[in-house]
Each structure stands twice: as structure tokens, then as C-alpha cells.
């Protein structure tokens, strides 16, 4: 049974040519993460697995950097990249938990952080 | 070309055991994780067991826990399952599948290899 | 476990037709549905995963949709090579489980 929930950064706002980290927290469940994907759209970012370590799909290798943590950081920031954003835990023996984060890249330099919520 | 080619299927009598194997090739084997999936004679799919890329985690459904063990030797390109007490519902044939990468069903799968459980 | 029920078991069409085979899951799993191909002598194929993405090397005539508990695979303008039997798997979570298959014949 899937017990857990995930704790995103929410909606965030970040600026043109800055960088953002994206952050997602599974809790209330014991259920061992195997890998964590990071996908934009159904474009696939980057891979944390659990006995290999960060794989950065080669398309964004230039502008997606691992971490801290499962976290995944975004730089060189454009407004292209404007969009939702998800991360995938892959457990065992729960299954899949799904994170989403929508990240609007301003123009202008008054880009705030948005508060935190959950999604079950 | 990806491969994947199963052996040591067999005839074997209630109680007993069998070690299958599967021979990978044309993928770095030692970056996927891997499961094995069996057909029952009536056709049934049912997954029996799942290997992540290093060997550290291992995962079973509840029909085959404590009587299958599956493994895998990444220098040779070989993955494996044990089974033990052996039952007559564990006649199938037994297919070696590739997981995908980002985790996401099973990309390739093998031909085969036939376990019948019979006394 | 999720339960998964495809139907129908049986189907017979004729070449350049569209058809459709349905799944069904006993609770919601999300978008994670995967569609494989079973043909004689040949190893099984992956043609569809999480719901609607085609895998690499599959035909445009292949196409997923759905989510949540129901699910459809649509085969359009069939070719003489796509009679086979077909087979649903939720990848949501473990156990992993299958449909029952359905078999595609030539009318």
C-alpha cells in the first residue's frame, strides 16, 4: 500500500539566465528509493539511482547539474524552460510516488520563491 | 544488438531446484537493472523477480519469496535465478527482460527457457 | 495486488482496419500502463510504456492513451505483420501485474 507523500518546492519563479534547484522529500513511508527521475514534460532530465549514482540525459548535460541531494539544479536559465517539472520516486516495494513543480522563468528581475505544498 | 539468451530449463520433481541463466549482450549490462518474468502453460504473464543494476537491491512478489533468489555476475554479462521448492505452479517458461532505464516497463526480452515441475 | 482485466480475450480484424484493446486496473496507477507484443518464434516487444509513450523503433500506428484505472492500446490501418497477441503490464507498482493478453486474429 502506498503510504508515502511527496514534498515539492511548489510553484517557483526563477530569472533569464539565473539557475533554480528543484527539490522533492518522500516521506510517511518506509519504502526503500531505488531511483529518482527528473523529467520535464516527458523529456527525461536526469536519473539518482540507487547503485549507479546521477546519470544527466546528454541533451542537458550543459545545463543541468546533480543535487544537493536528489534535488536537481537548472542553470543558464531561459524562458523556454518555463513549465512543469516532475520528479518520479521509484520504490520498493510502494512503486511510484510523483512530485510536480512548475518553474516560470521572468524576464524581470522580481522572481519569488512560492510556498511549499504536498501531493499525496 | 541487444540479446538476451536463457538456459537451464528442464523437467524436475516437486520439492526440487533449478538455477536458469541468462546471457546478455550488446548493452553494458552492468547499468540495467533486470528482472525475470514467467508464462504459465495457460498463457499467464507473472513477474517473478527483479535485480537492480549493481546487485545491491532484489525484489520478489509474495508467490515466490523464500524459495527464488535471483542474481546476476556483471563482469559476466550473466544474470540468474535460483529456485527451490519447486511446486507444479511454477511450470512455466521463464523469460529474462531488461528493465528501462529511466525504470519504465521492460524494453527486451529473451526467447525463453522451459521449466516443468512434475513428479 | 492490482488487478489488471483486458478485454476482449479474442479479436479478429482484417488488414487496414483500426482496432482497440482495453485494460482495466482494480485501483488507479496513474499513467503507468505498458503495452507489449508476443508474436511465435519472435521475443517479446515493448511497444507502449507509461500510457501513451512509444517506445524507440515502434510504428506511428501504435498509440496508448489513458490513466487512472482504464486504459486503451488502438492499432490503426493494421498490417498483415501486426496479428499477435498483446498483453497490458501496470508498472506503478510491485508486484508488477499483467493482463490476461488478447489475441489478434486475421478475419
Known amino acids: 500500500m502506498m503510504t508515502g507523500t511527496i514534498e515539492t518546492t511548489g510553484n517557483i519563479s526563477a530569472e533569464k539566465g539565473g539557475s533554480i534547484i528543484l527539490q522533492c522529500h518522500l516521506s510517511s513511508t518506509t519504502a526503500q528509493v531505488t531511483q529518482v527521475n527528473w523529467e520535464q514534460q516527458d523529456q527525461l532530465l536526469a536519473i539518482c539511482n540507487a547503485d549507479l549514482g546521477w546519470h544527466i540525459s546528454p541533451s542537458f548535460k550543459d545545463r543541468v547539474a546533480p543535487g544537493p541531494g536528489l534535488g536537481l539544479t537548472l542553470q543558464s536559465l531561459t524562458v523556454n524552460d518555463t513549465g512543469e517539472y516532475f520528479c518520479i520516486y521509484h520504490t520498493y516495494p510502494d512503486g511510484t510516488y510523483t512530485g510536480r513543480i512548475f518553474l516560470e522563468v521572468l524576464e524581470s528581475s522580481v522572481a519569488e520563491h512560492g510556498a511549499r505544498f504536498q501531493i499525496p | 544488438e541487444v540479446q538476451l539468451v536463457e538456459s537451464g530449463g528442464g523437467l524436475v520433481k516437486p520439492g526440487g531446484s533449478l538455477k536458469l541463466s541468462c546471457a546478455a549482450s550488446?548493452?553494458?549490462?552492468?547499468?540495467?537493472?533486470m528482472s525475470w518474468v514467467r508464462q504459465s502453460p495457460e498463457k499467464r504473464l507473472e513477474w517473478v523477480a527483479e535485480?537492480?543494476?549493481?546487485?545491491?537491491?532484489?525484489y520478489f512478489p509474495d508467490t515466490v519469496t523464500g524459495r527464488f533468489t535471483i542474481s546476476r555476475d556483471n563482469a559476466k554479462n550473466t544474470l540468474y535465478l535460483e529456485m527451490s521448492s519447486l511446486r507444479s505452479e511454477d511450470t512455466a517458461m521463464y523469460y529474462c527482460a531488461r528493465k528501462r532505464r529511466d525504470y519504465y516497463a521492460m524494453d527486451y526480452w529473451g526467447q525463453g527457457t522451459s521449466v516443468t515441475v512434475s513428479s | 495486488d492490482v488487478q489488471i482485466t483486458q478485454s476482449p480475450s479474442y479479436l479478429a480484424a482484417s488488414p487496414g482496419e483500426t482496432i482497440t484493446i482495453n485494460c482495466r486496473a482494480s485501483?488507479?496507477?496513474?499513467?503507468?500502463l505498458a503495452w507489449y507484443q508476443e508474436k511465435p518464434g519472435k521475443t517479446n516487444k515493448l511497444l507502449i510504456y507509461s500510457g501513451s509513450t512509444l517506445q524507440s523503433g515502434i510504428p506511428s500506428r501504435f498509440s496508448g492513451s489513458g490513466s487512472g484505472t482504464d486504459f486503451t492500446l488502438t492499432i490503426s490501418s493494421l498490417e498483415p505483420e501486426d496479428f499477435a497477441v498483446y498483453y497490458c503490464q501496470q508498472h506503478n507498482e510491485y508486484p508488477w501485474t499483467f493482463g490476461g493478453g488478447t489475441k489478434l486474429e486475421i478475419k
Open positions: 485501483k488507479s496507477i496513474s499513467k503507468y
Open positions: 535485480i537492480s543494476s549493481g546487485g545491491t537491491y532484489t
Open positions: 550488446g548493452f553494458t549490462f552492468s547499468t540495467y537493472a
